[in-house]
Each structure stands twice: as structure tokens, then as C-alpha cells.
């Protein structure tokens, strides 16, 4: 092909030419195209005009080219380049004009480039860039050039892994004349060890990221100081996984940031078995939103019932034990992947609408009620992945929920009584792989508004399907694959008048039956994969509904005999349905094994078996 | 509105078992919060002796834990404490109460005088 | 388990004046501390909850405040219906405990 040896990805839009041993810009690729990568390809220098033949370039990656040098208006005629992508090329040689003509450009990439300083980086003119990344570079001080005020769409500033030491006054005096309130800024990993105080004054961030920049304790709470009269939408502080410079916290370590006004605040990688953490945080009680993540902790007990965090996440974090957790204003918990508390004890959120409390190998005495969430206003419930739930409440107060998520999760008392009678709005159950064995037949009634139902690996008594889903009239996608079924009541499926996909995968079926689907006018999906399916229960196979669209029979054992001659032929009608047809193998008689069954003329000259 | 009533005999002999019930109107036991017993003897403060929940766990004051028990009947919507090995200590107004998601006591019975004597 | 020390355990008051009792843990509870009104021969109310919290119905001459490990209750101007004995209970671990009250008379 003309383009080759590059790939094309999109026609005539999106071609990779990476490490390709390219010592010049290929002329055989399409003057269309829009994505163009060339990455580890030893360019090493671009010369003027360098993309003249691309005039519709929108992305351009370069890394590693071993580019040294780059010369005036080598960018020149990409007036539509919005990504601009030059990670780890060294170079040494960058024209005043070097990005000229990028009239479009919204990110540029200059990661590991030898940039010892932004004073001399020529982007001024580049007034649409949102995002600039020069990390990993040499930039040792934090002066932000005069050019900074005609980047006023600037966005993102990522600054991280550079050798800045000391952030002055005078550095960010340009802030003052713009009001890049928008503007997101990471110094993360670079070594900080004076901020001097005021610098940040009247400064609104968006975003600021300060993460494993500190060699000890000290130096981090004269920092924090010196951020003083800083508003921030959003900070994150704290250390990496593999650059863990800090010893334990001490409850005077963020005192510093009462003089910050924060909206979300993001601890993480840190160690902090203090006995009282209220001391800790109390400059934090009004922000919005408050997340811990991968911090080792003692207890939040003491956390106050008065902070005002509307969104609280604790993620990936070290208990002794369950945290006592009540908050007044809180409306949503994400508690997920943390170790140590074994047992879920309950909290006091009078506002909460979003519970996620997955990944925590819980054990719950007692689920569902109001009282052990202390609300009544919750919509959103995931409790998967936990230990024991044992199922003793019917959700008594939780009328609210829309969305429920138990998926691996060990349900206890699930066939004792209609355990999710009261939960009129709910429009999503997940209870997947949750050891429910069915035996009781109004295990889903009160279910008005479901539209999702997903309860594969789970079993029946008996093997059987019963009519357990009669009050299920709003379902639109049933998930009843793994659940050991090799038989099913006819009437199963009859209220489900606007249920759209069906997976029956990975049961026990060894014939398939349309009756059950007589009553499925919306039926678009049905998927029979992976069964035992051999021929059909009956010689009178009718019509699936005329809404179906895709129907799956692979990995199935079907019995290509001449009594089954019927049965195959059907299949064969069936043909624009079937997905993946050519999976569909006979599995007897054995000259006949793995022979693809729409291939098989079934004239019944077979061999008689 | 949720209401307790506690019942049971006024007076227990010395080493013999205090038995005594909680009755509940207006919640079921079986939907939620837990259900506990709380004791005053007369002219002293409130002593808490344990909680049965809606699950039907159950959990003691580590003082009383080798002599309480703390059950339920559903089916009658009541609770019911028993304390063995009884003394003149154990002297006092039994009330039952529900705790809320919060560890405090917003429903109270009005409390039932029990005295141990011979 | 936690202790909680009230004082003073009686307090005589003549109306409209100001009472203040106050409630003090044996290790940091945080905000995790309730109050209630016990009058003679009845079960006590909760008055207060998470040391400043009015219950609703509660009148507003109620009021709290503290955190960690000092608390007050505080009534306004004291009406002769407010003789009762009050009690401090800590929520913040099992097993839940009581304050040993103050008792407030109507002078």
C-alpha cells in the first residue's frame, strides 16, 4: 500500500509510523490525514516547512525523535494542530519562530526536552493552549514569564519533576494581571523547600498539586504557610507510592491551611496514626469535598458531625477498624479498597444520596434499613465485592434507591422474604456471583421500575427458572448466564414486555425453545452461547420476535444427525441473526465434529447414526 | 410514631433470673435500628446493659455480659431482656429504648421498676 | 470504657436566670456527646444531640457546645417546667456511657 511501512488506522486520517527508522518525514501518507504518529523514529532535526504535505494535521506526536534542533516555522503550515506532542527528545537548538503558525494549538507536550527555563520558551504567541506540560525538565526557578498573560485559555500547567527549589513573590506576579481562575498547576515531585509568604496571596487556582516535594515535616508546614491568601478550587497534597520522603503526621502538620480557602481537598500516600485526628483536619471543615486515598490511619472516629464536606472518599486506606462516620451535610461516600475494618457498623448521614462502599471484604450483620445509613435519601448503593450480607431488612427507609450493587458479595437470607418489596424506583440490581440459590418466587417483587437485572453465577432449585420476574414489566437487560439452568417455565418471560437483551449464556440448556419468547416484543439480544444446545424441544419451531436482531448460539453441542434435520435447517433460516456463525461447530457424530453448521448440506444423504 | 412499653414482674428474688419485655408499636424490629435496654437505679444516673439489633445481633455491657441475654419475637414485634444471678444491685428502673443511626436515644419506654428482694 | 464527669451534680436556680452545666469526657469524643432532660418519675428526652444539635421541639433556650473532651448544656433563662435532672452521654464507643447528672431546682 502507498502509506506503507506505516499502519493505517483510520483511512486516509489516522496513520502510526512509530520506530519505523524514519530519518525524514514520510511523503507517502495521505495529505488528509488528521493523527499522525511518529514517534521513535531519529528525526533530529525539523527543519522549516518540515509538515507542509499535512495541512489538516490536528495531532502530531514526535516523541523520541532525537530531535536536536527545530527550526523556524517547522510547524508552519498546521494551522488545524490542536496536540503537539515532543516528549523526550533532547533539544538544543529551539528558533524564536519554532512554533509559529500553531494558531489552533490547545496542548503541547514538551516532557524531558532539556527545558531549563520557561523565560525562554517561545510560546507567547500561542493564545489558544490550554494545556502545557514541561515536566520532567530543568526548570529551576518558578518565575512565570511576562508571556503568561496572553495565555489566557491556559488550563493546565504541569511543572512536575523540574529542580524548582524556592517559589518567590515576584514569581507569580503575572497571576495578578490575568484572571486565570481556571488555571490547574502541579509541582508535584520537584524539590520545594521555601515558599516565601504571600506569594500565593489573592492567587485563584483551579487546581494546585503538591506531592512528594517535601524532605521532611518541618519544611512542609512553612510551605503550607507560605500559601497563605491562596483560593483554590481544588488541592491535593501528600507523597507518592515509591517517593515517601515524610515520617508521621503530627495534628499540627496542615495548620497552615486556614489560610487557604479550599473547595476539595486530596490526602494521599501518607501515615497517619495520630489518636485524634480532628486536630489534623479542623482547618478543613468547610471544604466541599475531602478524600484520603492511601493513607494509613488510625481512626476517623473524630471526624465532627458539624464539618461541612459534601463528599467525603476514603480509598485504598488502612483502619483498625470501621469508622464511626457521622456527618451532618455529607451526600456522598466512596469508601472502597480499604483494609482493616472487617465489619460494617453504621453511620449517621442524614444527607446522603451516593453510598459506595465496595472492595472492603465487609461483613454486613444486617442489611437494609434507613438506620444503618441514617437517611432516608439514599439513591445510589454499592456494596460489592464485601464478605457476609445477611439479607434482614427489606430496606425499610431506603424507598429512594434507584441503583443497587451486590455483585460478589456473599447474600445471606436471600429466599426467605421479598427482600426488595419496598424499592418502587429502583432501575438497576446487580447480584451477580453473590451465592443466591433461588427458591422462593418473590424474590424481585415490589421491583416496578427496573430496567437492569444482572444475577449471573448465581443458582435455582431444582435447575429451574420459575416466574419470579411478574413484576419486572419495566426490564430492558437480564444477565442469567452462569446460573447452572437447564430448564425454564414457559411463562418466565411474559411480563417483560420491554426487556431488549437476554443472556442465557453459559447454562445447561441442551435444547432451545422460541415459546418462552413468544411475549418479548422488544427483544433485540438473546444469547445462548456456551450451552449444551443440541437440537430444539420441539419439532414445531416457531419465529423469534420480529425485534430481535442478534442471536448467539456459539460454543454450543449441536447434533448434526438426520434427525435433527429440522432443527438445523432452522438454524441455517435464521442465519441474519446469528453472531459469530461461524463458531457454531457440530459436536456430533464425531466425523462430523467441528465442522462449522451453516456449512453442512443437510439433505439427509447423512449417515443415519 | 414509634412507641415501647416495657412489662414484667415488679419484684425477682435474690439469684434468680429478671425477665422482661419491650413491646413495639409503630416500626418493626425486623426493619431497622437496634433495640436496647437501659437501666437507672433509683436516685443514680443511666447505666447502658446492651442491644439486640434488627438483624438480631446482639451486644452487652462488658459488666453484665456473663449474665445478660437480650432476644426478640418478631412475629409479636417485642423484645425481651433476661439478667441471671440477680442481687440487690440489680435494683432499678428497666427501660428499653431505640437508638438511631447515631449512638443516641430518641424513643424511650417509660420504664418499669424492678426490685430484688426476698 | 469512657468516662463522663458532670458538674455541678445540683444546682438551685430561680427562673429567667442562666444555667450552665458542664460535661466532661475521659478521652477525646470528638463531637459525639448528647444530652437529656430527665424529669422525676418519667423516661429522659433527648434534648440535644452531637453536643450542639437541637432535637426538634426542643425550645431554643437549649442550647450546647464543646468537642473533644469538654461539653456544656446551656439553658437561656430558666423556666420553672426546666427542674429535672439532666444527663451527658457519649456516643463515640461502646459501651455507651452516661454522665452521672445534675440535678436543677426551681429556687
Known amino acids: 500500500e502507498s502509506w506503507e511501512p506505516c499502519v493505517e488506522v483510520v483511512p486516509n486520517i489516522t496513520y502510526q509510523c512509530m520506530e519505523l527508522k524514519f530519518y525524514k518525514i514520510p511523503d507517502n501518507i495521505p495529505f488528509s490525514t488528521k493523527n499522525l504518529d511518529l514517534s521513535f523514529n531519529p528525526l533530529r532535526h525539523l527543519g522549516s516547512y518540515s509538515f507542509l504535505r499535512f495541512p489538516e494535521l490536528q495531532v502530531l506526536d514526535l516523541s523520541r525523535c532525537e530531535i536536536q534542533t527545530i527550526e523556524d516555522g517547522a510547524y508552519q503550515s498546521l494551522s488545524h494542530l490542536s496536540t503537539l506532542i515532543l516528549t523526550g527528545n533532547p533539544i538544543q537548538s529551539l528558533a524564536l519562530g519554532a512554533f509559529s503558525g500553531l494558531s489552533s494549538l490547545q496542548k503541547l507536550v514538551a516532557v524531558e526536552t532539556n527545558l531549563a527555563s520557561l523565560e525562554n520558551f517561545p510560546i507567547g504567541h500561542l493564545k489558544t493552549l490550554k494545556e502545557l506540560n514541561v515536566a520532567h525538565n530543568l526548570i529551576q526557578s518558578f518565575k512565570l514569564p511576562e508571556y503568561f498573560s496572553n495565555l489566557t485559555n491556559l488550563e493546565h500547567l504541569d511543572l512536575s519533576s523540574n529542580k524548582i527549589q524556592n517559589i518567590y513573590c515576584k514569581d507569580l506576579q503575572v497571576l495578578h494581571q490575568m484572571p486565570l481562575s481556571n488555571l490547574s498547576l502541579d509541582l508535584s515531585l520537584n524539590p520545594i523547600n521555601f515558599i516565601q509568604p504571600g506569594a500565593f496571596k489573592e492567587i485563584r487556582l483551579h487546581k494546585l498539586t503538591l506531592r512528594s516535594n517535601f524532605d521532611d515535616l518541618n519544611v512542609m508546614k512553612t510551605c503550607i504557610q507560605g500559601l497563605a491568601g491562596l483560593e483554590v478550587h481544588r488541592l491535593v497534597l501528600g507523597e507518592f507510592r515509591n517517593e515517601r520522603n515524610l515520617e508521621e503526621f503530627d495534628k499540627s502538620s496542615l495548620e497552615g491551611l486556614c489560610n487557604l480557602t479550599i473547595e476539595e481537598f486530596r490526602l494521599t500516600y501518607l501515615d497517619c496514626y495520630l489518636d485524634n485526628i480532628i486536630d489534623l483536619f479542623n482547618c478543613l471543615a468547610n471544604v466541599s469535598s475531602f478524600s484520603l486515598v492511601s493513607v494509613n490511619i488510625k481512626r476517623v472516629e473524630d471526624f465532627s458531625y458539624n464539618f461541612r464536606w459534601q463528599h467525603l472518599e476514603l480509598v485504598n486506606c488502612k483502619f483498625e477498624q470501621f469508622p464511626t462516620l457521622e456527618l451532618k451535610s455529607l451526600k456522598r461516600l466512596t469508601f472502597t479498597a480499604n483494609k482493616g475494618g472487617n465489619a460494617f457498623s453504621e453511620v449517621d448521614l442524614p444527607s446522603l444520596e451516593f453510598l459506595d462502599l465496595s472492595r472492603n471484604g465487609l461483613s454486613f450483620k444486617g442489611c437494609c434499613s434507613q438506620s444503618d445509613f441514617g437517611t432516608t435519601s439514599l439513591k445510589y448503593l454499592d456494596l460489592s465485592f464485601n464478605d457476609v450480607i445477611t439479607m434482614s431488612s427489606n430496606f425499610l427507609g431506603l424507598e429512594q434507591l434507584e441503583h443497587l450493587d451486590f455483585q460478589h458479595s456473599n447474600l445471606k437470607q436471600m429466599s426467605q422474604f421479598s427482600v426488595f418489596l419496598s424499592l418502587r424506583n429502583l432501575i438497576y440490581l446487580d447480584i451477580s456471583h453473590t451465592h443466591t440459590r433461588v427458591a422462593f418466587n418473590g424474590i424481585f417483587d415490589g421491583l416496578l421500575s427496573l430496567k437492569v437485572l444482572k444475577m449471573a453465577g448465581n443458582s435455582f432449585q431444582e435447575n429451574f427458572l420459575p416466574d419470579i420476574f411478574t413484576d419486572l414489566k419495566n426490564l430492558t437487560f437480564l444477565d442469567l448466564s452462569q446460573c447452572q439452568l437447564e430448564q425454564l417455565s414457559p411463562t418466565a418471560f411474559d411480563t417483560l414486555n420491554k426487556l431488549q437483551v437476554l443472556n442465557m449464556s453459559h447454562n445447561n440448556f441442551f435444547s432451545l425453545d422460541t415459546f418462552p419468547y413468544k411475549c418479548l416484543p422488544s427483544l433485540q439480544v438473546l444469547d445462548y452461547s456456551l450451552n449444551h444446545i443440541m437440537t430444539s424441544n420441539n419439532q414445531e419451531l416457531q419465529h423469534f420476535p420480529s425485534s430481535l436482531a442478534f442471536l448467539n448460539l456459539t460454543q454450543n453441542d449441536f447434533a448434526c444427525t438426520c434427525e435433527h434435520q429440522s432443527f438445523l435447517q432452522w438454524i441455517k433460516d435464521q442465519r441474519q441473526l446469528l453472531v459469530e456463525a461461524e463458531r457454531m461447530e457440530c459436536a456430533t457424530p464425531s466425523d462430523k465434529q467441528g465442522m462449522p453448521v451453516l456449512s453442512l448440506n443437510i439433505t439427509c444423504q447423512m449417515n443415519k447414526t | 410514631q414509634v412507641q415501647l412499653q416495657e412489662s414484667g414482674p415488679g419484684l425477682v428474688k435474690p439469684s434468680d433470673t429478671l425477665s422482661l419485655t419491650c413491646a413495639v408499636s409503630g416500626y418493626p424490629i425486623w426493619g431497622g435500628y437496634s433495640w436496647h435496654w437501659i437501666r437507672q437505679p433509683p436516685g443514680k444516673g443511666l447505666e447502658w446493659m446492651g442491644y439486640i439489633h434488627y438483624s438480631g445481633y446482639t451486644d452487652f455491657n462488658p459488666s453484665l455480659k456473663t449474665r445478660i441475654t437480650i432476644s426478640r419475637d418478631t412475629s409479636k414485634n417485642q423484645f425481651s431482656l433476661k439478667l441471671s444471678s440477680v442481687t440487690a444491685v440489680d435494683t432499678a428502673v428497666y427501660y428499653c429504648?431505640?437508638?438511631?443511626?447515631?449512638?443516641?436515644?430518641?424513643?424511650w419506654g417509660q420504664g418499669t421498676l424492678v426490685t430484688v428482694s426476698s | 470504657e469512657i468516662v463522663l464527669t458532670q458538674s455541678p451534680d445540683f444546682q438551685s436556680v430561680t427562673p429567667k436566670e442562666k444555667v450552665t452545666i458542664t460535661c466532661r469526657a475521659s478521652q477525646s469524643i470528638s463531637d459525639h456527646l448528647h444530652w437529656y432532660q430527665q424529669k422525676p418519675d418519667q423516661s429522659p428526652k433527648l434534648l440535644i444531640k452531637y453536643a450542639s444539635h437541637a432535637i426538634s421541639g426542643v425550645p431554643s433556650r437549649f442550647s450546647g457546645s464543646g468537642s473533644g473532651t469538654d461539653f456544656t448544656l446551656t439553658i437561656n433563662s430558666l423556666e420553672a417546667e426546666d427542674a429535672a435532672t439532666y444527663y451527658c452521654q457519649q456516643g463515640h464507643s461502646f459501651p455507651l456511657t452516661f454522665g452521672g447528672g445534675t440535678k436543677v431546682e426551681i429556687k
Open positions: 429504648a431505640r437508638k438511631d443511626s447515631g449512638n443516641y436515644f430518641p424513643y
